[in-house]
Interface confidence: medium
Amino acid sequence: DTEIKVNPPQDFEIVDPGYLGYLYLQWQPPLSLDNFKECTVEYELKYRNIGSETWTTIITKNLHYKDGFDLNKGIEAKIHTLLPWQCTNGSEVQSSWAEATYWISPQGIPETKVQDMDCVYYNWQYLLCSWKPGIGVLLDTNYNLFYWYEGLDRALQCVDYIKVDGQNIGCRFPYLESSDYKDFYICVNGSSETKPIRSSYFTFQLQNIVKPLPPVCLTCTQESLYEIKLKWSIPLGPIPARCFVYEIEIREDDTTLVTTTVENETYTLKITNETRQLCFVVRSKVNIYCSDDGIWSEWSDKQCWEVEELLKKTLLL
């Protein structure tokens, strides 16, 4: 009874196509597969950013795999061949591991990289990123931003920089077609005549950094003697009504403050016969059905009503 053995995949490598963190892991079939011609060989691939405690594990029949990584750190990966039990009369056979690593050789000391990177996708329409200069850098240092997402054939450089003190400290992005619900990769690197500058890499999804416009057209109607209905409209723009969640701040007679969260554009409030004046503001955010995270809009303009006036209107009606 000879022991069945299989070789690891050949030429296992991590390839950087220049997409700022979206890397290709690729390999060739193992040597001496002739004995297993009737067999579909599988590969178990494990990979992670160096420093991460957990490996991502994939089992595939392909000779390549693609995923996003944090290029601020190194990447390690390992792969072995799997012969399914159907090919080996009963037990799965695994080869030894083939291993590969990849990292970008860092230029400059960590302090020189940009600080406080902040990106906001205003109203799901306009992306703006800003940063603060690194530390220990001269004001002759200039920073450049590059970005990529699936759908672009190469990484693009920002064409509309925001400048302060003669330095690029932000980027206004052009219209980004079909860019949400996928990883968006950014690299900010720098150049200086006096010292090398460390690059920084960032990855996020645009729908998770949306800051909507505030709601508009706040109205107030008295439904019954002690019930008031607050209404508002969704802000103009591409965000559908089903994607909003709202926070309302209500003041009764400049004292009672109620803050509540609602999922549609109305809120019914119970008042007492003591209530004289009612004021409210609303702000909006993209809800959990459309994103994993979001940024609250600014508050709407404050609207106030005298309860007596509302009551008169209701009685007239």
């Epitope: 600080q115 406080d116 800003s130 603060k132 925001i162 302060v164 003190d165 400290i169 932000g170």
Partner: nanobody, 115 residues
Framework: QVQLQESGGGLVQPGGSLRLSCTAS????????MAWGRQGPGKPRELIAT???????NYAESVKGRFTVSRDNAENTLYLQMNNLKSEDTAVYYC?????????WGQGTQVTVSS
């Protein structure tokens, strides 16, 4: 518009200490990022210490372990404690505040380290 005024500079011997202050005309509570920069004779200006609103600090290699940046939001003041001063620390020291996408600099205060 934020106006900044540095003070505390002067002549000091190598190994000595100085404490620079920077007073802002308005509240600095909402200003996330504040920094100290310096410009030595015949050199471009460089950032040497930063502090954010949470109090996290960062230092240039050349001053790490010797300089300490701090801020007092109630007093609208940024500080730079400089110990074990060296002749290469001779420069005009500037305070920098960056609210949002703007940047404001003070007029600077001269620090001369010489025996």
């Amino acid at each position: 518009q934020v106006q900044l005024q540095e003070s505390g500079g002067g002549l000091v011997q190598p190994g000595g200490s100085l404490r620079l202050s920077c007073t802002a005309s308005g509240s600095i509570r909402g200003i996330g990022y504040m920094a100290w920069g310096r410009q030595g004779p015949g050199k471009p200006r460089e950032l040497i210490a930063t502090i954010n609103s949470a109090g996290d600090t960062n230092y240039a290699e050349s001053v790490k372990g010797r300089f300490t940046v701090s801020r007092d939001n109630a007093e609208n003041t940024l500080y730079l404690q400089m110990n074990n001063l060296k002749s290469e620390d001779t420069a005009v020291y500037y305070c920098n505040a960056r609210p949002g996408l703007q940047s404001y600099w003070g007029q600077g205060t001269q620090v001369t380290v010489s025996s």
